[in-house]
Interface confidence: low
């Protein structure tokens, strides 16, 4: 459900990844969107500590830009999803091994909560930058 509002990012986890005055989409399906989305990032971020140095920065960028999507202040505030190409680059290039492990763990039900599922975008469902360059965010 894409009901929410635009606000400046005031969290800590994604400070180094998001632009200084980034306008992000806060989803009002959560009672406290800022806190809930920050917790999502924080939980997933901790799991990234064990991934390779090549994967980590790319995964952090993907994670922060997926959970705190860029917000377009329109007639109704709208989240701008990550471009499919950037998601696939992280999945197939920078983090191929880690992504496979994660998908296997998910398939076998080895995660304690569903929270990490919300942290990982499905690349195939994201818009391509070749369809409309303004319809998605570039990492």
């Amino acid at each position: 459900d894409n009901k929410g509002y635009c606000a400046q990012y005031r969290g800590e986890v994604c400070n180094a990844v998001l632009a200084k005055d980034a306008l992000v989409f806060l989803n009002t399906s959560y009672a406290d969107p800022e806190e809930a989305q920050e917790l999502l990032v924080h939980t997933a971020w901790n799991e990234l500590k064990v991934v390779s140095p090549v994967c980590r920065p790319a995964a952090e960028a993907l994670l922060c830009n997926h959970i705190f999507q860029e917000c377009s202040p329109g007639v109704v505030p709208t989240p701008i999803p990550i471009c499919r190409e950037y998601c696939l680059a992280v999945k197939e290039l920078f983090c191929a091994k880690e992504w496979l492990v994660m998908e296997e763990k998910t398939h076998r039900g080895l995660y304690r909560s569903e929270m990490h599922l919300l942290s990982v975008p499905e690349c195939s469902k994201l818009p391509s930058m070749h369809w409309d360059p303004t319809a998605c965010a570039r990492l």
Epitope: K3, Y5, C6, A7, Q8, L23, P73, V75, V76
Partner: antibody, heavy 118, light 108 residues
Framework: QVQLVQSGAEVKKPGASVKVSCKAS????????MHWVRQAPGQGLEWMGW????????NYAQKFQGRVTMTRDTSISTAYMELSRLRSDDTAVYSC???????????WGQGTMVTVSS | SYVLTQPPSVSVAPGQTARITCGGN??????VHWYQQKPGQAPVLVVY???DRPSGIPERFSGSNSGNTATLTISRVEAGDEADYYC???????????FGTGTKVTVL
């Protein structure tokens, strides 16, 4: 609390310009379009246009194209509406308004009376 | 450009129901908003997206929209409901907003 505070009443001569300000507080100013609406004495509401405070992009009603300019200063969370080549029928109350997460206008400024008279 | 037509006035006795219509070509395909404006005051949003009510607006205010007509219904009308009422739509093709002509509601 969330509010929009506008500048005070103005009296202008025909042919002059007027610039009305609208200061936002209590919410993220750059997160929502700011609209300008006017109402002539005894008349209905008339939408003039919007500004995207984040990008500075604007969209004006056909009627005001070429005469209206909407700007903003994000450092002080303030939107401006300037109307040039004023005529007597521009005498009206000018209001800023915004919709916080909905496409309707749920917050309004108190209005600024602009009188155009020779 | 898109035109919204409202009756100039509606009169209603206290405790009765007032219905204000807003006519527009295929208005049912658009989201309609309704505003109440009392003399010398800024408009107040009473119904948005056809039938949703902002917090603080009594349940007596309701809206519907289909075909070429949107309707604002005020049930159990009170003296304090006397005001001008305006419908509004966003015309997505032009990215412009349009207000209706306005209806003066008089409580007898």
């Amino acid at each position: 609390q969330v509010q929009l505070v506008q500048s005070g009443a103005e009296v202008k001569k025909p042919g002059a310009s007027v610039k009305v300000s609208c200061k936002a507080s209590g919410y993220t100013f750059t997160g929502y379009y700011m609209h300008w609406v006017r109402q002539a004495p005894g008349q209905g509401l008339e939408w003039m246009g919007w500004i995207n405070p984040h990008s500075g992009g604007t969209n004006y009603a056909q009627k005001f194209q070429g005469r209206v300019t909407m700007t903003r200063d994000t450092s002080i969370s303030t939107a401006y509406m300037e109307l040039s080549r004023l005529r007597s029928d521009d005498t009206a109350v000018y209001s800023c308004a915004s919709g916080l997460g909905i496409s309707a206008f749920d917050i309004w400024g108190q209005g600024t009376m602009v009188t155009v008279s020779s | 450009s898109y035109v919204l037509t409202q009756p100039p006035s509606v009169s209603v006795a206290p405790g009765q129901t007032a219905r204000i219509t807003c006519g527009g070509n295929n208005i049912g395909s658009k989201s309609v908003h309704w505003y109440q404006q009392k003399p010398g005051q800024a408009p107040v949003l009473v119904v948005y997206d056809d039938s949703d009510r902002p917090s603080g607006i009594p349940e007596r205010f309701s809206g519907s929209n289909s075909g070429n007509t949107a309707t604002l219904t005020i049930s159990r009308v009170e003296a304090g409901d006397e005001a001008d009422y305006y419908c509004q739509v966003w015309d997505s093709s032009s990215d412009h907003y349009v207000f209706g002509t306005g209806t003066k509601v008089t409580v007898l």
